[in-house]
C-alpha cells in the first residue's frame, strides 16, 4: 500500500493527477471506480479541505513520465478513511496512463479562485450546498436573502457546475452564520446569467441585513437518462447523466422491473422485454460506466430512485452495457 500521496500538475497543490509512492517510486492510480468518495479521502489526507471533483488525470501537464508505472488498478474508499492506504485497493493488472485518476480539492489555504470574482457555498455538506458567499477584491462576502430568488440560485448552481437548483426553505443554522461582511442584497437574476456577478443587485456593501438573513442554496447533480444507438428515442443502449458526464449502466441484476422504470421515466410506454441478443445489437458504449447492480421495485418514477452501487463502482466492461427497448 502507498506510503505517500501527492497531486501533480494542477494550479495548486490540492488538484492534479494522483500519484502514490511505493518502495521509493512514485506512480499513478488507474481511474477504475475512482469517484468523489476516494477524492474526499485523498483531500483529507493532504489537508486540502473538501473534495470538489474527479477530473481525468490526463488533463494535467506535464503528463506522467513514460517510465512511470501505474501502481494501483482501483481504489474503493467508503469516504470515512483518513488516508488512501486505508481504502480497499486492487493491484494493477491492465491500465495505462490514458486512465490516470485525477482529483481536485477545495484547498482552503489557497487564495486561488478559478473565477476571478468567485462564488462558493460555504459550511454545507460538500460544495453544492451551503451559505452563498461571493468573492470581491480578494474578500469573501455573504449575500442577503432580501430579493433572493430561485432564479438566482439557478445561476449559482450553474456557475459551480452543480446541476439544477433545489427549492429549499432551509436557513443557515446558527453555527453556519457568516462572520464576513455582507456583500449585497436585492439580487435580481433572470436565471440566464453565466455568473452571479452578472445579476443586477443593490449597491456593494450597502444594506441593512444581518447574518440571520444570509442566503442558503442547495443544488443537486443533474440526473438524466437517454437511449442511444436505436432507431428512435425509445430504444437503444442506456446512458445516464451524472456529474455532467454521460455513462453507461452495467447489466448485472438488470431485468424487467428496471426496464419498466426506464420506459416510464422516458415516457416511452412499456418495455418490450427484449431478448439478450436484441439488447446486444446496440453495441458497447465508451467512457464511464456509472451504475451497477441496479435494483428497482418497478414502482419508481425515475431510475435515480432505484437501489444501485455507489456511482462509478462496478466490475463490468462495456460488453455488459444495458440496452432497453420500449413500446414507444
Amino acid at each position: 500500500s502507498p506510503s505517500g500521496v501527492r497531486l501533480v500538475g494542477g494550479l495548486h497543490r490540492c488538484e492534479g493527477r494522483v500519484e502514490v509512492e511505493q518502495k521509493g517510486q512514485w506512480g499513478t492510480v488507474c481511474d477504475d471506480g475512482w469517484d468523489i468518495k476516494d477524492v474526499a479521502v485523498l483531500c483529507r489526507e493532504l489537508g486540502c479541505g473538501a473534495a470538489s471533483g474527479t477530473p481525468s488525470g490526463i488533463l494535467y501537464e506535464p503528463p506522467a513520465e513514460k517510465e512511470q508505472k501505474v501502481l494501483i488498478q482501483s481504489v474503493s474508499c467508503t469516504g470515512t478513511e483518513d488516508t488512501l492506504a486505508q481504502c480497499e485497493q486492487e493491484e494493477v493488472y491492465d491500465c495505462s496512463h490514458d486512465e490516470d485518476a485525477g482529483a481536485s480539492c477545495e484547498n482552503p489555504e489557497s487564495s486561488f479562485s478559478p473565477v476571478p470574482e468567485g462564488v462558493r457555498l460555504a459550511d454545507g455538506p460538500g460544495h453544492c450546498k451551503g451559505r452563498v458567499e461571493v468573492k470581491h477584491q480578494n474578500q469573501w462576502y455573504t449575500v442577503c436573502q432580501t430579493g433572493w430568488s430561485l432564479r438566482a440560485a439557478k445561476v449559482v448552481c450553474r456557475q459551480l457546475g452543480c446541476g439544477r437548483a433545489v427549492l429549499t426553505q432551509k436557513r443557515c443554522n446558527k453555527h453556519a452564520y457568516g462572520r464576513k461582511p455582507i456583500w449585497l442584497s436585492q439580487m435580481s437574476c433572470s436565471g440566464r446569467e453565466a455568473t452571479l456577478q452578472d445579476c443586477p443587485s443593490g449597491p456593494w456593501g450597502k444594506n441593512t441585513c444581518n447574518h440571520d438573513e444570509d442566503t442558503w442554496v442547495e443544488c443537486e447533480d443533474p440526473f438524466d437518462l437517454r437511449l442511444v444507438g436505436g432507431d428512435n428515442l425509445c430504444s437503444g443502449r442506456l446512458e445516464v447523466l451524472h456529474k455532467g458526464v454521460w455513462g453507461s449502466v452495467c447489466d448485472d441484476n438488470w431485468g424487467e422491473k428496471e426496464d419498466q422504470v426506464v420506459c416510464k421515466q422516458l415516457g416511452c410506454g412499456k418495455s418490450l422485454s427484449p431478448s439478450f441478443r436484441d439488447r446486444k445489437c446496440y453495441g458497447p458504449g465508451v467512457g464511464r460506466i456509472w451504475l451497477d447492480n441496479v435494483r428497482c421495485s418497478g414502482e419508481e418514477q425515475s431510475l435515480e430512485q432505484c437501489q444501485h452501487r455507489f456511482w462509478g463502482f462496478h466490475d463490468c466492461t462495456h460488453q455488459e452495457d444495458v440496452a432497453v427497448i420500449c413500446s414507444g
Epitope: 513514460k66 501505474v70 493488472y93 491492465d94 496512463h97 490514458d98 458497447p284 465508451v286 466490475d315
Partner: antibody, heavy 116, light 111 residues
Framework: QSLKESGGRLVKPDETLTITCTAS????????VGWFRQAPGKGLEWIGI?????STYYATWAKGRFTISKTSTTVDLKLTSPTTEDTATYLC?????????????WGQGTLVTISS | ELDLTQTPSSVEAAVGGTVTIKCQAS??????LAWYQQKPGQPPKLLIW???NLESGVPPRFKGSGSGTEFTLTISDLECADAATYYC?????????????FGGGTEVVVK
C-alpha cells in the same frame, strides 16, 4: 466483423517477412491489437501489442526481431532474420474493449514456414 | 519471467460429466487471469477474464475461480462441443511494461 491475417508463406532464413492483419467492420485505430503465434502442435505464444495511441510493447524474446506497425485498417508484423524456430501459424487479435492485454476477437491465422 | 503451469496436460471425461483444469502461477497475480478455448484449426476463443468473469455468449457451464497463484476452470454438464484445448493466460500492463503469458494448455477429450 472480422480480422484476417495475410502474407504467410515459405521464406528462407535471414529474409524479411511482413504479415498483415486486416480488419473488416472493426476499428483498429482506438483499441489494442496483439500478435501471437503457435508452432505446429504447440501452445500459444505472445509476440507483442500495438495500442490505439500507436505505442508498441514486445515479449522479451521478440524485441529487435519483430516490429509492429499500423494504419487505420491494418496492423503489420515484420519479422527480420527468421530461423526455422519461427515456423508457426501467426494470429492477430483485438483486445477486449477498454483493456490492453486479453483478447476477445481473433483472426484465423496465417502459416509462415521458414526453410532453406 | 512468470510461469503458468497448467494441469493436467490432458483429461478425458464423459458427456454430462465435469472437468476441472488448474493453472498455477509462479508468483501472485491477483485476479489477472483469462481462460481460452481452442479447437483444432480454429483461433482461441475468450471464455473467462479477470479470473471469474464470463465472456458474453459463453454458457455458464464454464466457471472460473481462484486468485493469487491458484486458478481453476470448471466445465460442468460436458458436451461433445467442449472437446478442445484450454489455455490460461496471465495479463499485466502497468503503463510501462506488458506481460502476456500462456499456460501450456490442457486437452479435453469428451467420450
Amino acid at each position: 466483423q472480422s480480422l484476417k491475417e495475410s502474407g504467410g508463406r515459405l521464406v528462407k532464413p535471414d529474409e524479411t517477412l511482413t504479415i498483415t492483419c486486416t480488419a473488416s467492420g472493426i476499428d483498429l485505430t482506438s483499441g489494442t491489437v496483439g500478435w501471437f503465434r503457435q508452432a505446429p502442435g504447440k501452445g500459444l505464444e505472445w509476440i507483442g501489442i500495438i495500442r490505439g495511441s500507436g505505442s508498441t510493447y514486445y515479449a522479451t524474446w521478440a524485441k529487435g526481431r519483430f516490429t509492429i506497425s499500423k494504419t487505420s485498417t491494418t496492423v503489420d508484423l515484420k519479422l527480420t532474420s527468421p530461423t526455422t524456430e519461427d515456423t508457426a501459424t501467426y494470429l492477430c487479435a483485438r483486445a477486449f474493449p477498454g483493456y490492453n492485454t486479453f483478447f476477445n476477437f481473433w483472426g484465423q491465422g496465417t502459416l509462415v514456414t521458414i526453410s532453406s | 519471467e512468470l510461469d503458468l503451469t497448467q494441469t493436467p496436460s490432458s483429461v478425458e471425461a464423459a458427456v454430462g460429466g465435469t472437468v476441472t483444469i488448474k493453472c498455477q502461477a509462479s508468483e501472485s497475480i491477483g485476479n489477472a487471469l483469462a481462460w481460452y478455448q481452442q479447437k483444432p484449426g480454429q483461433p482461441p476463443k475468450l471464455l473467462i477474464w479477470k479470473a471469474s468473469n464470463l465472456e458474453s455468449g459463453v454458457p455458464p457451464r464454464f466457471k472460473g475461480s481462484g486468485s493469487g497463484t491458484e486458478f481453476t476452470l470448471t466445465i460442468s454438464d460436458l458436451e461433445c462441443a467442449d472437446a478442445a484445448t484450454y489455455y490460461c493466460q496471465r495479463y499485466y500492463f502497468n503503463g510501462v511494461s506488458v506481460e502476456i503469458v500462456f499456460g501450456g494448455g490442457t486437452e479435453v477429450v469428451v467420450k
